[in-house]
Amino acid sequence: EWVKFAKPCREGEDNSKRNPIAKITSDYQATQKITYRISGVGIDQPPFGIFVVDKNTGDINITAIVDREETPSFLITCRALNAQGLDVEKPLILTVKILDINDNPPVFSQQIFMGEIEENSASNSLVMILNATDADEPNHLNSKIAFKIVSQEPAGTPMFLLSRNTGEVRTLTNSLDREQASSYRLVVSGADKDGEGLSTQCECNIKVKDVNDNFPMFRDSQYSARIEENILSSELLRFQVTDLDEEYTDNWLAVYFFTSGNEGNWFEIQTDPRTNEGILKVVKALDYEQLQSVKLSIAVKNKAEFHQSVISRYRVQSTPVTIQVINVREGIAFRPASKTFTVQKGISSKKLVDYILGTYQAIDEDTNKAASNVKYVMGRNDGGYLMIDSKTAEIKFVKNMNRDSTFIVNKTITAEVLAIDEYTGKTSTGTVYVRVPDFNDNCPTAVLEKDAVCSSSPSVVVSARTLNNRYTGPYTFALEDQPVKLPAVWSITTLNATSALLRAQEQIPPGVYHISLVLTDSQNNRCEMPRSLTLEVCQCDNRGICGTSYPTTSPGTRYGRPHSGR
């Protein structure tokens, strides 16, 4: 049976004066020689050799300083061996408890704690929680930390409360005001032994966050400016405001608005984000004849909503702005600024010279009547087709045009006319659009299947050929009306969409015939001039081959009679 005792040892001090700090004996010692051996951490496992045993007596001595934070207790395995080295007892686990001393100060988890809280927050609002640990014995006075605020910057009224036990930093009042102090620095101490022992300090930096608790205020009680009529302005006036909230935030940024006077939407106010000034712009020209002065009322708020602590106090404060409109001799202008003319259908592109489109007069803007004492000239006049009468403003063609002209865009030609005020030399410009019809210069052509036919059976197929896609079949073929006094020699019969049969209605003498043909497409578009077809009628032999020609002296006639020669 083991007989044992073990005294606790205090860390960090010389315990050797209390040696032996433990003793083991076996009651077998009374009858035989027993050797005592010990093992374990602090003996044959690091830290080696802290405890040694007298192998004969079983006295266990401590040889060096121990550290509770490293080894809170030592478990010593004790053996009692007989002369043969055999265990006479079951190995014994002996516990040597190490008593704590207050040799560790509190340690903050951070040297500087950062926190933030909105201004005007309610008292007792949580700002942050400080964290500190102490390596001494847990749940013991040596590791019980008490916190306290050592100092506050800026000094003055204490603004924060630090929970002694939890490390919670809370607001002491509801009067945090960023405009007074935008941040606070607290020096905090944590002391163990519940505030009576070792202490450490840390810093708390608390940012006071801005809320929109200040109204923007105009620096001046009223504003005025002058502007000439008919002009725009990107900066007629600047309004300065004062806002104590944090610069360049939505709590500071001003939003200007009209409360009255801008019903005509002549003005806008834009905020300059660098200076927070309001820039009054004229975005729609003013007319002195209608309005000699404008009385505006303006007000200002912030981009952000006002904070609940002040919103009930906000009133829209209107500030008067007087704008004097200055009369300007306005001179002349084309009203409207452009005019469209249309060339009537059926006019040939070759017969445009002297074709009158109409007049385009400038008006006197002061009287709104046709301007007098002006001279009209053409401005841009691509292709040189048009001319304007310098006095009457009558516009006419001075040149024919090819329907493929590059100056025709979307069936329109564009030109500019100028009105020059003979008093001031000021010029006003109007734009002229001329819509032109489809000139049939490229209308379909008719092609004969053959140049010569026999007088015995004078008939030939006529086909329509189009040069562009402007005309679309089916085509209608007709002969131009011939002079009444002459008998109708030729007839034409449609064969299909693009061809017809031309036939003499009686036997005709050989010769060269000129036949006028009118072609009309499915849209009822037709060539301005009939197409002239030339056909030779000859005397054929029995094989159907042209033989002798007609007498060269035969008088020919137009409209389907033989031609006088070839």
Epitope: S16, P46, F48, G49, I50, T63, A64, E70
Partner: antibody, heavy 127, light 110 residues
Framework: QVQLQESGPGPVKPSGTLSLTCGVS?????????WTWVRQPPGKGLEWIGE???????FLNPSLKSRVTISVDKSNNQFSLKLTSVTAADTAVYYC????????????????????WGRGTLVSVSS | QSVLTQPPSVSGTPGQRVTISCSGS????????VYWYQQLPGTAPKILIY???QRPAGVPDRFSASKSGTSASLAISGLRSEDEADYYC??????????FGGGTKLTVLG
């Protein structure tokens, strides 16, 4: 478990400065140990350079004291050796080790030993 | 020149007993604990004996040590081939700090 790993820039020129770092992993450098540097020239015996406690206290080999600086970096859990004005005689395998150093009570001797070693790094001094 | 003096080499055959001596002075061996380290080829040293004569857990009882005055010795009985290594004694010197012996190379013959 705790491990030690030496690291450094490799060869050093004569009269230059030898710099080594020992990283401690698996445990804290703030434990109650003495963090030690020991060197071994090729084919020769061990030589104790010096040791440091986490609070910055040091013991240094008197024969090297004028050239040696040992420092501790708690935030990175490592300690370092600087040896200035090196010569070819400083060519060695440099070991970092965890030491136990306890002054004995009256009548008891001092404990001083190393229970954990790094693998060592060879530093050559040559031009 | 090491502060603690060891023989440069010793040898023995398997099964034999060999002894390595370590001599010093009163400022280190005489007044402080002696430690012995084993360094196998290409590895870092490992503690073999602490507090003059104590074996750490895991060290075979073939290794024993003693200290007398200003000298110490390490004995290895039942020699085995894996014991081939360098052996160093070490102690704290109250004036010079830590001191090592010059090391002894143990060769296992045969």
């Amino acid at each position: 478990q705790v491990q030690l790993q030496e690291s450094g820039p490799g060869p050093v020129k004569p009269s230059g400065t030898l710099s080594l770092t020992c990283g401690v992993s698996g445990g804290s450098i703030s434990s109650n140990h003495w963090w030690t540097w020991v060197r071994q020239p090729p084919g020769k015996g061990l030589e104790w350079i010096g040791e440091i406690y986490h609070n910055g206290s040091t013991f240094l080999n008197p024969s090297l004291k004028s050239r040696v600086t040992i420092s501790v970096d708690k935030s990175n859990n490592q300690f370092s050796l600087k040896l200035t004005s090196v010569t070819a005689a400083d060519t060695a395998v440099y070991y970092c080790a965890r030491g136990w150093h306890r002054t004995g009570f009256r009548g008891y001797p001092s404990h001083w030993y190393f229970d954990l070693w790094g693998r060592g790094t060879l530093v050559s001094v040559s031009s | 020149q090491s502060v603690l003096t060891q023989p440069p080499s010793v040898s023995g055959t398997p099964g034999q007993r060999v002894t390595i001596s370590c001599s010093g002075s009163s400022s280190h061996i005489g007044s402080n604990y002696v430690y012995w380290y084993q360094q196998l080829p290409g590895t870092a040293p490992k503690i073999l004996i602490y507090s003059n004569d104590q074996r750490p857990a895991g060290v075979p009882d073939r290794f024993s040590a003693s200290k007398s005055g200003t000298s110490a010795s390490l004995a290895i009985s039942g020699l085995r081939s894996e014991d081939e290594a360098d052996y160093y004694c070490a102690a704290w010197d109250d004036g010079q700090g830590g001191v090592f012996g010059g090391g002894t190379k143990l060769t296992v013959l045969g």
